[in-house]
């Protein structure tokens, strides 16, 4: 015998209290598949979360984060504070990237500048807290007649622009 509940479409539940007829999921609940015996409670986008999309009878609410925060985890399960470019989030809050590292986003950690010499290249543009080093041609390419590019003079403290 076929289960009568299998005829209940998404957005409904098989109501045992009403001879297993298909009843609509009540407000603030949903069922994303057919044949369900209960509806799931909708997610509430509260506090630092905000509603991206309301809960419908067939799909859960979608949340993201209020301005100044960004999503982490599957389905935006957490909101993490934004920092400025050139910073990273620590337990004590947003901290500037250490010398020799950079972060060009409002999230994530500071990453080391590219080591141009590992690729046999020279530094064309110094790195900053917000931007990676730009590597230029290899020193061999800078032999007379090969290029008119002049390698930059080494800065006293490479990486940071003078104030």
């Amino acid at each position: 015998l076929q289960d009568p509940c299998s005829n209940c479409p998404a957005g409904t539940f098989c109501d045992n209290n009403r001879n297993q007829i298909c009843s609509p999921c009540p407000p603030n609940s949903f069922s994303s598949a057919g044949g369900q015996r209960t509806c799931d409670i909708c997610r509430q986008c509260k506090g630092v979360f905000r509603t991206r999309k309301e809960c419908s009878s067939t799909s859960n609410a979608e949340c993201d984060c209020t301005p100044g925060f960004h999503c982490l985890g599957a389905g935006c399960s957490m909101c993490e504070q934004d920092c400025k470019q050139g910073q990273e989030l620590t337990k004590k809050g947003c901290k500037d990237c250490c010398f020799g590292t950079f972060n060009d986003q409002k999230r994530g950690i500071c990453r080391p500048w590219t080591n141009c010499s590992l690729d046999g290249k020279s530094v064309l543009v110094n790195g900053t807290k917000e931007r990676d080093v730009v590597c230029g041609p290899s020193p061999a390419d800078l032999s007379p007649g090969a290029s008119s590019v002049t390698p930059p003079a080494p800065a006293r403290e490479p990486g940071h622009s003078p104030q």
């Epitope: 479409p9 998404a10 957005g11 409904t12 009843s23 609509p24 999921c25 009540p26 407000p27 603030n28 069922s31 986008c45 905000r50 509603t51 991206r52 999309k53 309301e54 809960c55 419908s56 009878s57 067939t58 799909s59 949340c63 993201d64």
Partner: antibody
């Protein structure tokens, strides 16, 4: 309560902004919806701004209609108006965290004619 | 698009009768359907949402049922004040933040 304003007679192509002013509740906690009704015709859903400040529009309204909000008002900006846009425009508050229009204003009439 | 087909376009019944209005969606919308009542010169009034949930202050003579593509509004023990046009409306999200929150064409309820 909800009340619309800004409806008037305009010539085709003229942009127009309607304003919905609310009292007794906080706009930022609700879906705020715009619906229109041409004279003697049925209802047409335009779109809404939700409690997360996201806007959604029906296919025919996307690009020509823009919904925005302040703390006490919701605006509907309309461009490239034609005679077919002649209608009463209703603003409504969504019921129970949804985009079903629950609390409606009386409407404001927009007439587009040369 | 999601097309909502409402039947009949008009119904005439005596006081205390029962009226049934049907709404058919062109594709499954789960239980995301509402019913509204509109009287001439007035804004619509929400009667039922989520297919069967009665809105605040609406008498229990109004009831909604259905799911998927077939929905019904039933008005029992018809009163003079029920003379109005009734609309169904779905909630349906498409891609690219486009919505298909379509209204049906309406059903006019008049008295014999």
């Amino acid at each position: 309560s909800v009340e619309e304003s800004g409806g008037r007679l305009v010539t085709p192509g003229t942009p127009l902004t309607l304003t919905c002013t609310v009292s007794g509740f906080t706009i930022s906690s609700h879906h705020m919806i715009w619906v229109r009704q041409a004279p003697g015709e049925g209802l047409q859903y335009i779109g809404f701004i939700n409690d997360g400040d996201y806007t959604y529009y029906t296919n025919w309204a996307k690009g020509r209609f823009t919904i925005s909000r302040t703390s006490t008002t919701v605006d509907l900006k309309m461009t490239s108006l034609t005679a077919a846009d002649t209608a009463t425009y209703f603003c409504a508050r969504g019921v129970d965290g949804t985009s079903y229009p629950g609390l409606w204003g009386p409407g404001t009439l927009v007439t587009v004619s040369s | 698009d999601v097309v909502m087909t409402q039947t009949p376009a008009s119904v005439s019944e005596p006081v205390r009768a029962t009226v049934t209005i049907k709404c058919q969606a062109s594709q499954s919308i789960g239980a995301d359907l509402a019913w509204y009542q509109q009287k001439p010169g007035q804004p619509p009034k929400l009667l039922i949402y989520r297919a069967s949930t009665l809105a605040s202050g609406v008498p229990s003579r109004f009831s909604g049922s259905g799911s998927g593509t077939e929905f019904t509004l039933t008005i029992s023990d018809l009163e003079c004040a029920d003379a109005a046009t009734y609309y169904c409306q779905c909630i349906y999200y498409g891609t690219d933040d486009v919505i298909y929150h379509t209204f049906g064409g309406g059903t006019e309820v008049v008295f014999k």
